[in-house]
C-alpha cells in the first residue's frame, strides 16, 4: 500500500489497532522490515507499507482527519470530498473526521443528501455499519450532538463555533462519497438546530445533546420539523431527567403554526402536544444548575407523523360531572409488536394534549377526540366505587349497575366496566339482581353473549372469584357476604346492540355469614350447570356457599354431580355438603373428603345445596360442578 498526502492538505492518516478481539495472533504494519503497531502519516508525507497478516481488517482501523480552519481564512464550503479516495486506502474499517473550527459568530450548517439521517441511542448500532457522529463545541468543551445512521429524517444540522463530523465506514462498505456538504450561516445563537423532514407518514426518535449524559448547562437546542400540511404530528417524551436548577426553569417550547400563544411553553413532565398540522419547532432550554448538586437534564423523544383520521376532527363529550368515585381509562389493547411502521394511536383531551392512554375522572365534563388510524386498537376500562359507610342509611338501598350512555356513545370498544361494591364489615351484605336471569359460564355450557359479569371478592386478602355470568340463564339473584367487584366485560363489538340486555341492581341487605347464596329458578327447557366459586383454584378454606333451587309445582328436578368423588383432602376440619328439602326440612349430609358424591337425585320441591369447605391440603382442592334439569311430573320416573 502507498499513501501520499498532498502538502497543505491538513489531512492526517492514522492506522492503529482497533478494539482487541480474541484473535490469538498479532498483526503488524510493516515498513522497511520494521513491524509497528501504529502508523501516522501527515500532510506532505508518502509512506509505503504492508501488513504482516492476511486479514488486517480484523486488527486495524484507519482514521483520516481533515482539519478545516475557518478562523484565519475563507471556509471551503460546498460538498465535502472523501480524501484520500477510499480506493487508495487499505480495506480497513475507516473513520473520516472533519474538524471545522470557526468563530462564535459564524453559523455552520451540515446538509445531508438523501438518504437523510436517523439518530440512534446508546447501545444501538446501524444495520449497515455506517455511522455519523457529530459533535459541536462550547468554548473548549466538546458537546456530542448525536450518532446517526442512514435512512432517517434529519436533513440539516446547524451549529456555531465549530463542528466535528466523523463518518465511520466498515471495511467492506463501497461508499466513496461523504454524503454531506457544509454551508455558512449567520449565528444561530444556540447550541444547535436539527432539521427533520418528513415526506410522508413515519416516526423519528431524537435526543438532547450529550444524551444519555447531561445537556450542557443553560443551553438551548432546537429541532425544526418539516411536515406536509395534510399530515399530523404528535410528540411523546420517551425518557427525560431534570437537573437541579438554581435560576430559571428547564422547559420545552413549541412554535406551532396557527397557535395564538406561540411559543407554547411546557414542562418536561407535561403531556406534550399532538395532532399538530404542518411544520413546527421544538426547543429544549436548560437552566443555571446548582453547583453543589447539578443533576442532569436529558431528553429522548419521539415525533410521530401520520394522516389525520376522520375521528380527529370529531369532539366527544364525556360528561362525568354527576358521577362520583369513577374513572375512565382509554388505552391501547395489548397486541403483538410488529416490526413495520405502525401509525400512532392517540386519544386527545381538548384536541391538543394527546397520548396513547388517557384517564378521565368523575366530577367534570371532558371533551376528547382521537388521532388514530384504527380505533379498534383502543379500548376502554372504567372503574366505579359504590360504598356504604353508614349501615342505617344504606340498608335496603338499591343502585343500578349500568354503563352510562355517554360512555356507550364513544367510538371505542368498552372492555371492562368494574363496580367496586363496599359495605361496612359484619354489618351489611349485598344482593345482585339481574334484569335478565343469568347463566354461569362453564366448559359444558359456555356463555356466548357479547358480555359477561365477572363477580369476585374485593377484599384484598381474599382470593375468591364467584364466576362469570351472562344473561339468558336461571340464576335469579346472587347474595354475597361482603365487598365485591362486579365487572361487565365485553367480548364482541355487538355489545353496543345488546347493551339493553345489561342491567344489574345491587341492594344492601342485612348481614349474613355465608360467602355467597345463588337463587336458581331453572327453566323447563334447559339443563342448568352450576359450579363452585374459584373454579380451578378451589373453594377457599372454610368457605361456605349455597344454592337455593326452586322447583315448580308440576316439575321434578334432577340433581347430577359430574364426579364420583370431590377430590378434596382436608388438612384441618371437614368438608361437607347438605342437600335439604325446603318444605320438609329433610336433609342429607355428605362428607366431601370421605364419601362418594351422591348419584343423580330427584327433587319434587325446592331445595338447598350447601357446600362448606375445610382447610384443604395444597393441590387437593374442592371444585364441584353439578347440573339441575327439570322434567314434568307426569313422566313416570320409575
Amino acid at each position: 500500500f502507498e499513501i501520499a498526502l498532498p502538502r497543505e492538505s491538513n489531512i492526517t492518516v492514522l492506522i492503529k489497532l482497533g478494539t482487541p478481539t480474541l484473535l490469538a495472533k498479532p498483526c503488524y504494519i510493516v515498513i522497511s522490515k520494521r513491524h509497528i503497531t501504529m502508523l501516522s502519516i501527515k500532510s506532505g508525507e508518502r509512506i509505503v507499507f504492508t501488513f504482516s497478516c492476511q486479514s488486517p481488517e480484523n486488527h486495524f482501523v484507519i482514521e483520516i482527519q481533515k482539519n478545516i480552519d475557518c478562523m484565519s481564512g475563507p471556509c471551503p464550503f460546498g460538498e465535502v470530498q472523501l480524501q484520500p479516495s477510499t480506493s487508495l486506502l487499505p480495506t480497513l474499517n475507516r473513520t473520516f473526521i472533519w474538524d471545522v473550527k470557526a468563530h462564535k459568530s459564524i453559523g455552520l450548517e451540515l446538509q445531508f443528501s438523501i438518504p437523510r439521517l436517523r439518530q440512534i441511542g446508546p447501545g444501538e448500532s446501524c444495520p449497515d455499519g455506517v455511522t455519523h457522529s457529530i459533535s459541536g463545541r462550547i468554548d473548549a468543551t466538546v458537546v456530542r450532538i448525536g450518532t446517526f445512521c442512514s435512512n432517517g429524517t434529519v436533513s440539516r444540522i446547524k451549529m456555531q463555533e465549530g463542528v466535528k463530523m466523523a463518518l465511520h465506514l466498515p471495511w467492506f462498505h463501497p461508499r466513496n462519497v461523504s454524503g454531506f456538504s457544509i454551508a455558512n450561516r449567520s449565528s444561530i445563537k444556540r447550541l444547535c438546530i436539527i432539521e427533520s423532514v418528513f415526506e410522508g407518514e413515519g416516526s423519528a426518535t431524537l435526543m438532547s445533546a450529550n444524551y444519555p449524559e447531561g445537556f450542557p448547562e443553560d443551553e438551548l437546542m432546537t429541532w425544526q420539523f418539516v411536515v406536509p400540511a395534510h399530515l399530523r404530528a404528535s410528540v411523546s417524551f420517551l425518557n427525560f431527567n431534570l437537573s437541579n436548577c438554581e435560576r430559571k426553569e428547564e422547559r420545552v417550547e413549541y412554535y406551532i403554526p396557527g397557535s395564538t400563544t406561540n411559543p407554547e411553553v411546557f414542562k418536561l413532565e407535561d403531556k406534550q402536544p399532538g395532532n399538530m398540522a404542518g411544520n413546527f419547532n421544538l426547543s429544549l432550554q436548560g437552566c443555571d444548575q446548582d453547583a453543589q448538586s447539578p443533576g442532569i437534564l436529558r431528553l429522548q423523544f419521539q415525533v410521530l407523523v401520520q394522516h389525520p383520521q376522520n375521528e380527529s376532527n370529531k369532539i366527544y363529550v364525556v360528561d362525568l360531572s354527576n358521577e362520583r368515585a369513577m374513572s375512565l381509562t382509554i388505552e391501547p389493547r395489548p397486541v403483538k409488536q410488529s416490526r413495520k411502521f405502525v401509525p400512532g394511536c392517540f386519544v386527545c383531551l381538548e384536541s391538543r394534549t394527546c397520548s396513547s392512554n388517557l384517564t378521565l375522572t368523575s366530577g367534570s365534563k371532558h371533551k376528547i377526540s382521537f388521532l388514530c388510524d384504527d380505533l379498534t386498537r383502543l379500548w376502554m376500562n372504567v372503574e366505579k366505587t359504590i360504598s356504604c359507610t353508614d349501615h342505617r342509611y344504606c340498608q335496603r338501598k338499591s343502585y343500578s349497575l349500568q354503563v352510562p350512555s355517554d360512555i356507550l356513545h364513544l367510538p371505542v370498544e368498552l372492555h371492562d366496566f368494574s363496580w367496586k361494591l363496599l359495605v361496612p364489615k359484619d354489618r351489611l351484605s349485598l344482593v345482585l339482581v339481574p334484569a335478565q336471569k343469568l347463566q354461569q359460564h362453564t366448559h359444558e355450557k359456555p356463555c356466548n353473549t357479547s358480555f359477561s359479569y365477572l363477580v369476585a371478592s374485593a377484599i384484598p386478602s381474599q382470593d375468591l372469584y364467584f364466576g362469570s355470568f351472562c344473561p339468558g340463564g336461571s340464576i335469579k339473584q346472587i347474595q354475597v357476604k361482603q365487598n365485591i367487584s362486579v365487572t361487565l366485560r365485553t367480548f364482541a363489538p355487538s355489545f353496543q346492540q345488546e347493551a339493553s340486555r345489561q342491567g344489574l341492581t345491587v341492594s344492601f341487605i342485612p348481614y349474613f355469614k355465608e360467602e355467597g347464596v345463588f337463587t336458581v329458578t331453572p327453566d323447563t327447557k334447559s339443563k342448568v350447570y352450576l359450579r363452585t366459586p374459584n373454579w380451578d383454584r378451589g373453594l377457599p378454606s372454610l368457605t361456605s356457599v349455597s344454592w337455593n333451587i326452586s322447583v315448580p309445582r308440576d316439575q321434578v328436578a334432577c340433581l347430577t354431580f359430574f364426579k364420583e368423588r370431590s377430590g378434596v383432602v382436608c388438612q384441618t376440619g371437614r368438608a361437607f355438603m347438605i342437600i335439604q328439602e325446603q318444605r320438609t326440612r329433610a336433609e342429607e349430609i355428605f362428607s366431601l373428603d370421605e364419601d362418594v358424591l351422591p348419584k343423580p337425585s330427584f327433587h319434587h320441591h325446592s331445595f338447598w345445596v350447601n357446600i362448606s369447605n375445610c382447610s384443604p391440603t395444597s393441590g387437593k382442592q374442592l371444585d364441584l360442578l353439578f347440573s339441575v334439569t327439570l322434567t314434568p311430573r307426569t313422566v313416570d320416573l320409575t
Epitope: K16, T21, A24, K25, P26, C27, R34, I36, T37, H59
Partner: antibody, heavy 119, light 107 residues
Amino acid sequence: EVQLQQSGAELVRPGALVKLSCKASGFNIKDYYIHWVKQRPEQGLEWIGWIDPENGHTIYDPKFQGKASITADTSSNTAYLQLSSLTSEDTAVYYCARLTGTTYAMDYWGQGTSVTVSS
Amino acid sequence: DIVMTQSHKFMSTSVGDRVSITCKASQDVSTAVAWYQQKSGQSPKLLIYWASTRHTGVPDRFTGSGSGTDYTLTISSVQAEDLALYYCQQHYSTPYTFGGGTKLEIK
C-alpha cells in the same frame, strides 16, 4: 493451563553452538508468536526475536542477526533457539515467551534456560 | 531503535506506601508499553500492557498510565511480595526494547 517448558541448563565451549527448546502446553503455538529474550547475569532483558510458527516467518533484533536462529516444529508444539559461535558474551539465561494479538506483549514465559560458555 | 529509559535503578519504599516507577521512551510509542515484574530467580511476569490494561490475575493495586513518551507503573499500597525488579518494554515497533529495570526494595 498455559505452560512453556524449557530445556535444561547448558555448559558449552567457546565457538560451539547450542540449541535450546521450548515446549508449549495448554495452547497451540501455531496460533501465537513465540519470542526469545536474553538476560545476562545481573543485567536487564534483551529481545532476540520472534517466530510465527505457522509459516516459520522470523524477525530478529539486528544485533542478534547471524548469532541466533529461531525455528519451530508445530507437530511437537515446540520452538527452538539456536545460538552459534558462542563466546562468553552469550553466557545468559534465555527465556521463551508467547505473544498474543490481544496484549501485543509477552503474556506467558518459560522458566528460562541457563547457558554458560566456558573453556 | 527506540530506547526505553528507567531513570531509577533502585527505589526504596515501605509496606503500605504508594510508589511510582517511571519509564521514558526516546520517541512517541502511542501507549504500546508493557510492564513486567521479575522476582529473584524467577522468569518475568506480565503486569500491564497497552500502558494501562491490567493482565488477568494481576492485583488491582498495580496500575499503569501514560502516553506519548512518558509512562508510569504505580503500586497504590506496596506489599512485601512486591519486592522485585520491574521492567518497562515498548511493543510499538521492532526491535522490541526493554528499560534497564527498577529494583523495588522494602525498607
